[in-house]
């Protein structure tokens, strides 16, 4: 991983990079390598494409071995017919203050999202729009015999419910989390990302997790039964250890992977969950990375194009662990 005194390059000649991928010097200034692209794993030795404004985001300072290529100047957002730069804040209406972050818009309510539970003083609370005011306000429907300032004595109707969905509420924060993007690699270790404001200060942040749709070395077509065209979730023979840039997972995992088809369809994760995985590196360092674990796969004709640079953003979003609303990854 680290730059040693003497340069050692994998090949004498410069590698041939795919179209649109820059040939750059590695982080040690030794060898010419193909620059890593948006969402790919990067290290000191494997730098991100500087010509596309990418940098290697290592996350926490303690985790300076492996990062993810991230855009310095993120993708703009189109919202309500207007284009906003990444990082730009705007008011979508009198009720919401929004921010663009890497192509995703997140909004924080300017009006109080407070919930009011019934009480003797306010037996039937409800929010109403008052003339000339942007934000709705609480009013308390009261019985006719109510005194001017004392509490109400009327019974509360059990069938009434009040306020927005409690699972999506945090004080004055409209919790928004995008689906996880598709894995950046169709086989082997890749990256999946999402944008959320499900954090203490309701700030938009980009989260990433490792993902492996299937191992590259597995010849899954062999396992397709006669007369069948697909193998959706092949059985894994034995528990596996994950590898990440020379580091190996501490535990073994009986992970599910997605299979393949012989009829032109592709199989991708459908329901997933996110769990932390500890990797041990040759120098003894332990690092923890969140990783996607597949619950179910789906086979379909909605396959990514070979050269679709937007595939990881728009293609086959994954379901199943939209913001764990009470955990922070």
């Amino acid at each position: 991983q680290d730059c040693s005194a003497q340069c050692q390059c994998a090949a004498e000649a410069a590698p041939h990079c795919p179209a649109g991928v820059s040939l750059v010097l590695d982080g040690c200034g030794c060898c010419r390598v193909c620059a890593k692209q948006l969402g790919e794993l990067c290290t000191e030795r494997d730098p991100c494409d500087p010509h596309k404004g990418l940098f290697c985001d290592f996350g926490s300072p303690a985790n300076r071995k492996i990062g993810v290529c991230t855009a310095k100047d993120g993708a703009p957002c189109v919202f309500g017919g207007s284009v906003y730069r990444s990082g730009e804040s705007f008011q979508s209406s009198c009720k919401y203050q929004c921010t663009c972050l890497d192509g995703a818009v997140g909004c924080v309510p300017l009006c109080s999202m407070d919930v009011r539970l019934p009480s003797p003083d306010c037996p039937f609370p409800r929010r109403v729009k008052l003339p000339g005011k942007c934000c709705e306000e609480w009013v308390c429907d009261e019985p006719k015999d109510r005194t001017a300032v004392g509490p109400a004595l009327a019974a509360y109707r059990l069938e009434d419910t009040f306020g927005p969905d409690p699972t999506m509420m945090r004080a004055n924060c409209l919790v928004q989390t995008t689906e996880w993007s598709a894995c950046s690699k169709t086989c082997g270790m890749g990256i999946s990302t999402r944008v959320t404001n499900d954090n203490t200060f309701c700030r938009l942040e980009k989260q990433s997790r490792l993902c492996m749709v299937r191992p590259c070395e597995a010849d899954l077509e062999e396992n397709i039964k006669k007369g069948k065209k697909c193998i959706r979730t092949p059985k894994i023979a034995k528990p596996v250890k994950f590898e990440l840039s020379g580091c190996t997972s501490v535990k073994t995992y009986r992970a599910k992977f997605c299979g393949v088809c012989t009829d032109g369809r592709c199989c991708t994760p459908h329901r997933t969950t996110t769990l932390p995985v500890e990797f041990k590196c040759p120098d003894g360092e332990i690092m923890k990375k969140n990783m996607m674990f597949i619950k179910t796969c789906a086979c379909h004709y909605n396959c990514p194009g070979d050269n679709d640079i937007f595939e990881s953003l728009y293609y086959r979003k994954m379901y199943g662990d939209m913001a764990h609303h009470h955990h922070h990854h």
């Epitope: 003083d121 005194t147 509490p151 509360y156 109707r157």
Partner: antibody, heavy 114, light 110 residues
């Protein structure tokens, strides 16, 4: 963000008057009432009184003669006054928002001792 | 003097179901008592869980439910989690004043 914060003296002499202030933010005192509750050391909660959103008050009958609760809506403050304090009034005093007692202050511990 | 009574302590295993009750000394609890349930975890502030008999606060998980059960107010926890270990107080409204119960210390085994 909804918050309530109690403030006042930590030590009061017997027969003196205790005055506590509850400063609220994140909601209006014209929309929500505020309750006062106390918890003596090692014991349960005891409801003391409330000032409703429209200014009316209700008190625990046991404290009626000693208690006054008022508010300054523009300052977002509720003032709690208890006269003729006694060592048995030693407790942590809390203010809490009406509507399910949903939000509480952290409490202020008051010791009554000479 | 009106007395509100709760179980002093209850013990439950993780994943289990437990019901805490709140009894009034002057008769059956009704919706006019606006039963409230308040939680205090060790070292944390009090916070309301349920108001108006059965309405959950925004932060109250769906595994907590408030109801009236056999003339008492009840708080039922289904699929109990270790983090539910806490002191639980009920409060009932009696036309001019609230009365708090003595509290239930809920212990989650394991």
């Amino acid at each position: 963000e909804v918050t309530l914060k109690e403030s006042g003296p930590v030590l009061v002499k017997p027969t003196e008057t205790l005055t506590l202030t509850c400063t609220v933010s994140g909601f209006s005192l014209s929309t929500f009432g505020v309750h006062w509750i106390r918890q003596p050391p090692g014991k349960g909660l005891e409801w003391l009184g409330v000032i409703w959103r429209r200014g009316g008050t209700d008190y625990n009958a046991a404290f009626m003669s000693r208690l006054t609760i008022s508010k300054d809506t523009s300052k977002s403050q509720v003032v709690f006054t208890m006269t003729n304090m006694d060592p048995v009034d030693t407790a942590t005093y809390y203010c809490a928002r009406d509507g399910g007692f949903d939000y509480w202050g952290q409490g202020t511990t008051v010791t009554v001792s000479s | 003097e009106t007395v509100v009574t709760q179980e002093p302590s209850l013990t439950v295993s993780p994943g289990g179901t437990v019901t805490l009750t709140c009894r009034s000394s002057i008769g059956a609890v009704t919706t006019s008592n606006y039963a409230n349930w308040v939680q205090q975890k060790p070292g944390q502030a009090f916070r309301g869980l349920i108001g108006g008999t059965s309405n959950r606060a925004p932060w109250t998980p769906a595994r907590f439910s408030g109801s009236l059960l056999g003339g008492k107010a009840a708080l039922t926890l289904s699929g109990v989690q270790p983090e539910d270990e806490a002191e639980y107080y009920c409060a009932l409204w009696y036309s001019t004043h609230y009365v708090f119960g003595g509290g239930t210390k809920l212990t989650v085994l394991g």
